[in-house]
Interface confidence: medium
């Protein structure tokens, strides 16, 4: 062939037209041609259309072509593998009927920001999906249903920050699921269902222990020997299990499956048996699991914050384990928020007295307890975030902005990490400050109104700010998956305005509760 | 045809700041990954930074924390913001050119000198 | 981090020659799904920027002639020049682009017999 070189390798066809600054597929290739690689080309946009004629193609890999259109028309009843990967792809194509074949599907490295529900129909012969690297914050939750043959499936190196609990319902040939890297701060009660999930990689998360992380905390007990760190260049099943990879952001890095989950309502007459009615409730010390009792008593409809029932830590030892990190995805609209008191001994607050109730946002629909299977609306247009456009643009340096709020602690993982895309002029401060942090952890999806009519101390005296407040992302290591390199994210930043100089952000008050 | 120009080297002391730039122009600039890399005086080639099309920015160790790695697309230019500069920070600083993020380096400037000295 | 070690750190050789570098990867730097590997190799003269040869380990980039070939796959690649020119010599390195952070060989100096 003129411009591309034709090779046959057994009964392949294999055509190479990679690196010849195509603008559209080139003329007069082979009609049995099997294995069509296009990859590093200038196509733009591309019709799966052109490709009808060739009626034995298996695997067509357009990866990194700068692709922002792929039009789905006319149908590759035989196509097995497609590669996306590196485009500029900012929808999921809707490929069901084109491809009706499909078994391997790869659209790393793209602009998904969100997928719609019906994005995977058709796609019945589905056994791998990579979307590794995109900017997904939310999935709907039947995406994976027209899927039941998935093997593997990649959402790493995103921006989620929760899943839908039957995300993974019928897949009972998954064997391998990678999450790393995300901003997932729980997983939902039942989410892993029954089967048997071999590989699973969930580091890099910044997972709030809480009475909500109870499930998923049993899960990894349960499961701890199919709990990997991804390494680059090492096969899955010569990989070393490391469950205490996946890691409590908000408690010095405490290993999930051991979070010791003191105070946390038990299954009971008086509890809400909807809570965790998956696992009983645990105290682990140790390697030691012991069941445990606790007198707090819940209303059985209590509505749950993303750290779970919000005075569910221990008053034991407070210090160490309140959260003081921001977690997503607080709303950046201009709504009252309240800043409660961190719960310390030395006042009393009678549980049966405060109320849960979600209130309308102003600017969506009220949005579901995470500890449902509903999905989460996309968030609001005015979220403060650095989500990419198709024409990014990273602020220009200046020469003395604000210290980032990412602090580099160097981890055993051999890859880079993110930090804030806004230069700084000073380096980041010591984690070790004593100084209150300006920015105290927020509520995510649900919007919870406290009703608290009981004894609180003066030292609790509520504070009210307007500002707005925005994301801020833990700063993670990363680790390359599946053959593919690495993508990490940017620290979505915050800003509270002059908060540190605020004489009521007391070290005491820690949690934001949006109203 | 590609072009990449760096500017902003120059003598600084240990515990500085310098940003350095990179103006790109003879490509879309926006549709590509951009990197630094640096090569001390008589050493070998180290990657500094990169940056996505889509302006997610990756850093190695050495100097995590420390450098800032951005771009303004409406200018073509790419950034490195160096703070708390060290002594073994001194190197010609390249700026290049990749398809995506983990592809090899297909265009390189001809490089920027910093120094760091007291 | 993958380490890549490059030998011989230098070498002698006159115009015509035949020269062979090779590089070595502390793991595989092949992608499974593609069966491409991801090793880059450069050549730098003094005083100049490094200028891409090969990619995917076989891959001449455009305008780069022929007499350089890549070859090698897993752990093990090499670089030739069949048949070595005066405006070839310089000093040569290899780079992975597989897993991140990216590492270069330390170079090898091709210098004149």
């Known amino acids: 062939h003129p411009i591309c070189e034709v090779s046959k390798v057994a009964s392949h066809l294999e055509v190479n037209c990679d690196k010849r600054n195509l603008t559209a597929l080139p003329p007069d290739l082979p009609k049995d041609t099997t294995i069509l690689h296009l990859s590093e080309n200038l196509l733009y946009t591309f019709s799966l259309a052109t490709l009808m004629p060739y009626t034995r193609l298996t695997q067509l890999n357009l990866d990194r072509c700068e692709l922002t259109k792929l039009q789905v028309d006319g149908t590759l009843p035989v196509l097995g593998t497609l590669d996306l990967s590196h485009n500029q792809l900012q929808s999921l194509p809707l490929l069901g009927q084109t491809l009706p074949a499909l078994t391997v599907l790869d659209v790393s490295f793209n602009r998904l920001t969100s997928l719609p529900l019906g994005a995977l129909r058709g796609l019945g012969e589905l056994q791998e999906l990579y979307l590794k690297g995109n900017e997904l914050k939310t999935l709907p939750p039947g995406l994976l249903t027209p899927t039941p043959k998935l093997e593997k499936l990649s959402l790493a190196n995103n921006n989620l920050t929760e899943l839908p609990a039957g995300l993974l319902n019928g897949l009972e040939n998954l064997d391998t699921l990678l999450l790393q890297e995300n901003s997932l701060y729980t997983i939902p009660k039942g989410f892993f269902g029954s089967h048997l999930l071999p590989f699973a990689f969930l580091h890099g998360n910044p997972w709030l222990c809480n009475c909500e992380i109870l499930y998923f905390r049993r899960w990894l007990q349960d499961n701890a020997e199919n709990v990997y760190v991804w390494k680059q260049g090492v096969d899955v099943k010569a990989m070393t299990s490391n469950v205490a990879s996946v890691q409590c952001d908000n408690s010095d890095k405490f290993p999930v499956y051991k979070y010791p989950g003191k105070g946390c309502p038990t299954l009971g007459d008086e509890g809400d048996t909807d809570l965790y009615d998956y696992y009983p409730e645990e105290d682990t010390e140790g390697d030691k699991v012991r069941a445990t009792r606790t007198v707090v008593k819940f209303p059985t409809k209590a509505h749950t914050t993303p750290w779970g029932l919000f005075y569910s830590w221990s008053t034991a030892s407070l210090d160490s384990q309140m959260p003081s990190s921001l977690h997503p995805t607080q709303e950046s609209t201009k709504e009252q928020t309240t800043f409660p008191p961190r719960w310390t001994p030395n006042f009393t607050l009678h549980m049966e007295s405060i109320t849960f109730s979600k209130t309308p946002k102003s600017t969506t629909e009220p949005t579901p307890s995470p500890t449902t299977s509903e999905p989460v609306p996309e968030p609001a247009p005015n979220m403060t975030t650095l989500e990419p456009t198709p024409s990014p643009t990273t602020p220009e340096p200046t020469s003395e902005p604000a210290p980032s709020p990412t602090t580099p602690e160097p981890t055993s993982e051999p890859a880079p990490s993110p930090t804030t895309p806004e230069p700084t002029s000073e380096p980041a401060p010591s984690p070790t400050t004593p100084e209150p942090t300006p920015i105290p952890t927020i509520a995510t999806s649900p919007t919870i109104l406290v009703s608290a009519t009981s004894l609180i101390t003066p030292k609790s005296t509520f504070l009210t700010t307007t500002k707005p407040v925005s994301l801020l992302e833990s700063t993670k290591k990363t680790i390359p998956e599946l053959d593919q390199p690495p993508k990490l994210r940017g620290v979505l930043q915050g800003h509270l305005e002059s908060s540190r100089n605020d004489p009521f952000l007391h070290p005491d008050f820690c949690c934001l509760l949006p109203l | 045809q590609v072009q990449l120009v760096e500017s902003g080297g120059g003598v600084v002391q240990p515990g500085r700041s310098l940003r350095l730039s990179c103006a790109a122009s003879g490509f879309t600039f926006s549709s590509f990954a951009m990197s630094w890399v640096r090569q001390a005086p008589g050493k070998g080639l180290e990657w500094v930074a990169s940056?996505?099309?889509?302006?997610?920015?990756y850093y190695p160790d050495s100097v995590l924390g420390r450098f800032t790695i951005s771009r303004d697309n409406s200018k073509n230019t790419l950034y490195l913001q160096m703070n708390s500069l060290r002594a073994e920070d001194t190197a010609v600083y390249y700026c290049?050119?990749?398809?995506?993020?983990?592809?090899?380096?297909?265009?390189w400037g001809q490089g920027t000198l910093v120094t760091v000295s007291s | 981090d993958i380490q890549m070690t490059q030998s011989p750190s230098s070498l002698s050789a006159s115009v015509g020659d035949r020269v062979t570098i090779t590089c070595k990867s502390s793991q595989s730097l092949l992608n499974s799904r593609n069966q491409k590997n991801y090793l880059a190799w450069y050549q730098q003269k003094p005083g100049k920027a490094p200028k891409l040869l090969i990619y995917?380990?076989?891959t001449r980039e455009s305008g780069v002639p022929s007499r350089f070939s890549g070859s090698g796959s897993g752990t093990d690649f090499t670089l030739t020049i069949s048949s070595l020119q005066p405006e070839d010599f310089a000093t040569y390195y290899c780079q992975q682009h597989y897993s991140s952070p990216w590492t270069f060989g330390q170079g090898t100096k091709v210098e004149i017999k």
């Open positions: 995917f380990t076989s």
């Open positions: 290049a050119r990749s398809r995506g993020y983990e592809d090899y380096f297909d265009y």
């Open positions: 940056i996505t099309s889509a302006g997610t920015p």
